[in-house]
Interface confidence: medium
């Protein structure tokens, strides 16, 4: 008789989740010599141990500590790029500007990017049918707690100038409820970080508005200034040209406003 299973509102664990995590770990450690010492089987065991046999609405940051320890990684603290609601462009940027890093360019971020996972209380099974939705079910679910934990640690490590890419096409360019707005902003360390520099990415080709004057950007500046951190904002009017100029900074068209 099939056992009754909790139905959650969100999609279930990504198919072939264990294999995907393990394969990503192996690939990452091969590409990044500084992480070659990492034992990917131990990483998977620690990852699994964070959520297997636990109620998927009762996950804590402590559950992920063994994984955090194994995935400890030093990135240049003054080369951190945060992003909110504009992941693809942020990743395209760091693929070109190889000395800058998003969270997903680190081992732990790379392992979990775009994946979903959860288990069930008191069984060693992975739930491939459904997982808790952050809004409809609970916030302390395995995926949300993971990203909150790694995002906090990533922000805490930042120093000097921290960049954040924001989506100028959204109604809330800065959203207090995003991971950036609820976790990363509040975990930048004022004694290490001098300036948060926001890059507001424009969507429309003919959009010449100064989105740095947007009320939500002013709200971000207010939060940042109260944390003793300077704030700077730049409009990126042409994201396609912006990327092109990162690739070819000597191009004559790259001296003008982008």
């Amino acid at each position: 008789v099939p056992r009754w299973r909790q139905q959650w509102s969100g999609p279930g664990t990504t198919k072939r989740f264990p294999e995907t995590v393990l394969a990503r770990c192996v690939k990452y450690t091969e590409i990044h010599p500084e992480m070659r010492h990492v034992d990917c089987q131990s990483v998977w065991d620690a990852f699994k141990g964070a959520f297997i046999s636990k109620h998927p609405c009762n996950i804590t940051e402590e559950d992920y500590q063994p994984l955090m320890k194994l995935g400890t990684q030093t990135v240049p603290c003054n080369k951190i790029l945060l992003w909110s609601r504009i992941k693809d462009l942020a990743h395209q940027f760091t693929q070109v500007q190889r000395d800058m890093f998003t969270l997903e360019d680190t081992l732990l971020g790379y392992l979990a990017d775009d994946l979903t996972w959860c288990g069930e209380f008191n069984t060693s099974k992975i739930n491939y049918q459904s997982c808790p939705d952050w809004r409809k079910d609970c916030s302390n679910n395995p995926v949300s707690v993971f990203w909150k934990t790694v995002s906090r640690r990533f922000a805490e490590a930042a120093c000097d100038v921290v960049h954040v890419m924001l989506n100028g096409s959204r109604s809330k360019i800065f959203d207090k409820n995003s991971t950036f707005g609820s976790v990363e902003v509040h975990n930048l360390q004022p004694e290490k970080v001098q300036t948060l520099e926001a890059w507001v990415i424009h969507g429309g080709r003919e959009d010449s508005r100064d989105l740095c004057q947007d009320p939500t950007i002013k709200e971000l500046e207010s939060i940042i200034s109260k944390r003793n951190i300077q704030f700077s904002c730049k409009n990126i009017y042409r994201p396609d040209k912006f990327l092109q100029c990162v690739k070819n900074p000597e191009d004559s068209s790259c001296t003008s406003e982008i």
Epitope: C159, D160, V161, P190, E191, K192, V193, Q194, T195, E197, W199, C212, K218, E221, S222, S225, K226, R227, N228, Q230, F231, S232, C233, K234
Partner: antibody
């Protein structure tokens, strides 16, 4: 070090461009470079800053419109002043805030602007 | 812009004495405040940053403190070389506050 230049005797309603030149470091690194002025026998007055990383330019509310701060090269930042009046007569300093809240601890010696007919 | 009200405008004290200068911010600027010393014909010299941190090379006779929106610079064991004008500055340059200076305090050493 920082050195200001461009100070001069100008007539009222005239314009002037002051230049701040860095030596020993460059503005390719992200710094806050600020202009501050001091009228003879008076106190210090903050005018504007430029963040050399993004080009962000906060101004004192009284300075908006007549003053324009720009990064013109990897070693120069300028301050353009228009519609000059006698009240703009002052020594103009440029200064660098170099690190995490360590205050503006690198100053030029200043350049004198005199506005008189 | 934030308004920085500095008091007194002038203060006189004997060598070996103590001087206290206050700076009141019109709004909460956290610890985003610096103190400078300026002598005639010279640019300002940084003494204190982040309200209470001593700048490198500055004597420990200079002490900065904060209570809410009121900031204090205390100079103890006064020396003749301390005769100068002292300024406070809000060191947040963004549009929230602006890098406003206080009006200055002249310190005369007798």
């Amino acid at each position: 070090s920082l050195e200001e230049s461009g100070g001069d005797l100008v007539k009222p309603a005239g314009s002037l461009t002051l230049t701040c030149t860095a030596s020993g470091f460059s503005f390719s690194t992200s710094y806050w470079i600020c202009w501050v002025r001091q009228a003879p026998g008076k106190g210090l007055e903050w005018i504007a800053c430029i963040y050399t990383g993004s080009g962000s330019t906060p101004y004192a509310s009284w300075a908006k419109g007549r003053f324009t701060i720009s990064k013109t090269s990897s070693t120069t930042v300028t301050l353009q002043v228009t519609s000059l009046t006698a009240a703009d007569t002052a020594t103009y300093f440029c200064a660098r805030d170099p690190g995490v809240h360590s205050g503006t601890n690198l100053w030029g010696q200043g350049t004198l602007v005199s506005v008189s007919s | 812009d934030v308004v920085m009200t500095q008091t007194p405008a002038s203060v006189s004290a004997a060598v070996g004495g103590t001087v206290t200068i206050k700076c009141q911010a019109s709004e909460d600027i956290n610890t985003l405040l610096a103190w400078y010393q300026q002598k005639p014909g010279q640019p300002p010299k940084l003494l204190i940053y982040l309200a209470s941190n001593l700048a490198s090379g500055v004597s420990s006779r200079f002490k900065g403190s904060r209570s809410g929106t009121e900031f204090t610079l205390t100079i103890s064991d006064l020396e003749c070389a301390d005769a100068a004008t002292y300024y406070c500055q809000c060191t947040y340059y963004g549009s929230t506050y602006g890098g406003t200076f206080g009006g200055g305090t002249e310190v005369v050493v007798k």
